[in-house]
C-alpha cells in the first residue's frame, strides 16, 4: 500500500511539475525592465524567451517575437535548450510512469517490469527538474552579470547630448514558477525512484515446514513428496524421513511481499 | 548605435506654425514611447510633449495643451510634433527623446537627440 502510494503521489507531483515547466517556459514575465529615470511616459517591459512585451499605463498591451537567432544571446539559446529538453524528458518520463503505475494494469506485466519503468520514469524526472532549475538560474544569473543595474550612456551623433539611464531589470513571476516547478519534478522523480524499492522483486528464503504422522509402519521414501510454500516450484527433490517434521531449506520465491497487502 | 534626426525647427512669428519632426534608426527592436523636450537659455529642460507607440497614449505640458499636437508614424519610427498659435515664450532648444528596446534580447535605453532650434519672433 504504502508503495503504490508513493508512486502515485510521485507521479501527480512530478505531473504539477511538468506543467509548471511547460508553463514557465511559454510565460512573458522572464525579467522586466523598468528605468528608474523614466522622461517619457509610463511604460513597462517584461520579456520571455520567445518574445518581448510592452505595457503601458492606458492597459494596452503589445509582443513581439524575437525573429533573429544571431542576434540573441547564447545564454539566453541555452536557457530555450535545457527548457525544452526539461519538458521532452518529463513528457516521455509521464508518459513511462503511467504504465508503471502498481493500480494499472495492462496484461500480465510482472512487477519486475514496472519496477524497471518507475526507476527509469523517476530519472526521467530527476533529469527534468535539474535541467529546468538549470534553465532558469542560468537566465536569472544573466540578469544579475549582464544586465541587472546597466547604467547607459547615449551618444547621438556629433556633438550630441549624452543622457545617463538606468534601466533596473527584475526577476519575473517565470523565473519562479521554473524554480518551484522543477523542484517539484525533482521531488516526484525522487519518490518515483523510491517507490520502484518497494516495487523490485527480492529474493526471499520462505523455510516450509512438512508434517508427517509418525507410524511403526512408515519406512524409507526415496524422493519423498516435495513441500511447497504455494509461492514457487520446489526445484530440489529433497527425501523426506519418517518421525515428525522436517525443514524444506531455501525454496526461492520471486514474486514481492508487497503483492497481498 | 540608434541615432535620433530631428528636423523643421526656425524661425517664425507669433501666432505661426512649425512642425517638427524625429526619425529613429539603427538597431530597434521596438519603440516604447517618442517625445519632445525643450530648453530655453538659463532654464532646466522641461517635457513638452510624448506618445506612446503602441497604444499613443499622449501626455502634454499644462503650457502647450491645445496647442501643439504629437502623432506618430510606426512604421517609419517617428514622431511630429505640430505647434500651432506659437509664442514668444515657446523659443527654445527642442530634444526629441525615444524610450526604445534595442538589439536582438532587447535592452531598454532612453536616447535624446542633438535637438532642433525653434525661436519665435516677430
Known amino acids: 500500500m504504502a508503495v503504490t502510494a508513493c508512486q502515485g503521489l510521485g507521479f501527480v507531483v512530478s505531473l504539477i511539475g511538468i506543467a509548471g515547466i511547460i508553463a514557465a517556459t511559454c510565460m512573458d514575465q522572464w525579467s522586466t525592465q523598468d528605468l528608474y529615470n523614466n522622461p517619457v511616459t509610463a511604460v513597462f517591459n517584461y520579456q520571455g524567451l520567445w518574445r518581448s512585451c510592452v505595457r503601458e499605463s492606458s492597459g494596452f498591451t503589445e509582443c513581439r517575437g524575437y525573429f533573429t537567432l544571431l542576434g540573441l544571446p547564447a545564454m539566453l539559446q541555452a536557457v530555450r535548450a535545457l527548457m525544452i529538453v526539461g519538458i521532452v524528458l518529463g513528457a516521455i518520463g509521464l508518459l513511462v510512469s503511467i504504465f508503471a503505475l502498481k493500480c494499472i494494469r495492462i496484461g500480465s506485466m510482472e512487477d519486475s517490469a514496472k519496477a524497471n519503468m518507475t526507476l527509469t520514469s523517476g530519472i526521467m524526472f530527476i533529469v527534468s527538474g535539474l535541467c529546468a532549475i538549470a534553465g532558469v538560474s542560468v537566465f536569472a544569473n544573466m540578469l544579475v552579470t549582464n544586465f541587472w543595474m546597466s547604467t547607459a550612456n547615449m551618444y547621438t551623433g556629433m556633438g550630441g547630448m549624452v543622457q545617463t539611464v538606468q534601466t533596473r531589470y527584475t526577476f519575473g513571476a517565470a523565473l519562479f514558477v521554473g524554480w518551484v516547478a522543477g523542484g517539484l519534478t525533482l521531488i516526484g522523480g525522487v519518490m518515483m525512484c523510491i517507490a520502484c524499492r518497494g516495487l523490485a522483486p527480492e529474493e526471499t528464503n520462505y523455510k516450509a515446514v512438512s508434517y508427517h504422522a509418525s507410524g511403526h509402519s512408515v519406512a524409507y521414501k526415496p524422493g519423498g513428496f516435495k513441500a511447497s510454500t504455494g509461492f514457487g516450484s520446489n526445484t530440489k527433490n529433497k527425501k523426506i524421513y519418517d518421525g515428525g517434521a522436517r525443514t524444506e531449506d531455501e525454496v526461492q520465491s520471486y514474486p514481492s511481499k508487497h503483492d497481498y497487502v | 548605435q540608434v541615432q535620433l534626426v530631428e528636423s523643421g525647427g526656425g524661425l517664425v512669428q507669433p501666432g505661426g506654425s512649425l512642425r517638427l519632426s524625429c526619425a529613429a534608426s539603427?538597431?530597434?527592436?521596438?519603440?516604447?514611447?517618442m517625445g519632445w523636450y525643450r530648453q530655453a537659455p538659463g532654464k532646466q529642460r522641461e517635457l513638452v510633449a510624448a506618445?506612446?507607440?503602441?497604444?499613443?497614449?499622449?501626455n502634454y505640458a499644462d503650457s502647450v495643451k491645445g496647442r501643439f499636437t504629437i502623432s506618430r508614424d510606426n512604421a517609419k519610427n517617428t514622431v511630429y510634433l505640430q505647434m500651432n498659435s506659437l509664442k514668444p515664450e515657446d523659443t527654445a532648444v527642442y530634444y526629441c527623446?525615444?524610450?526604445?528596446?534595442?538589439?536582438?534580447?532587447?535592452?531598454?535605453?532612453?536616447?535624446w537627440g542633438q535637438g532642433t532650434q525653434v525661436t519665435v519672433s516677430s
Open positions: 527623446n525615444a524610450d526604445l528596446l534595442v538589439g536582438g534580447f532587447p535592452r531598454r535605453n532612453v536616447y
Open positions: 506618445i506612446t507607440f503602441g497604444g499613443g497614449s499622449t
Open positions: 539603427g538597431s530597434i527592436f521596438s519603440i516604447n514611447a
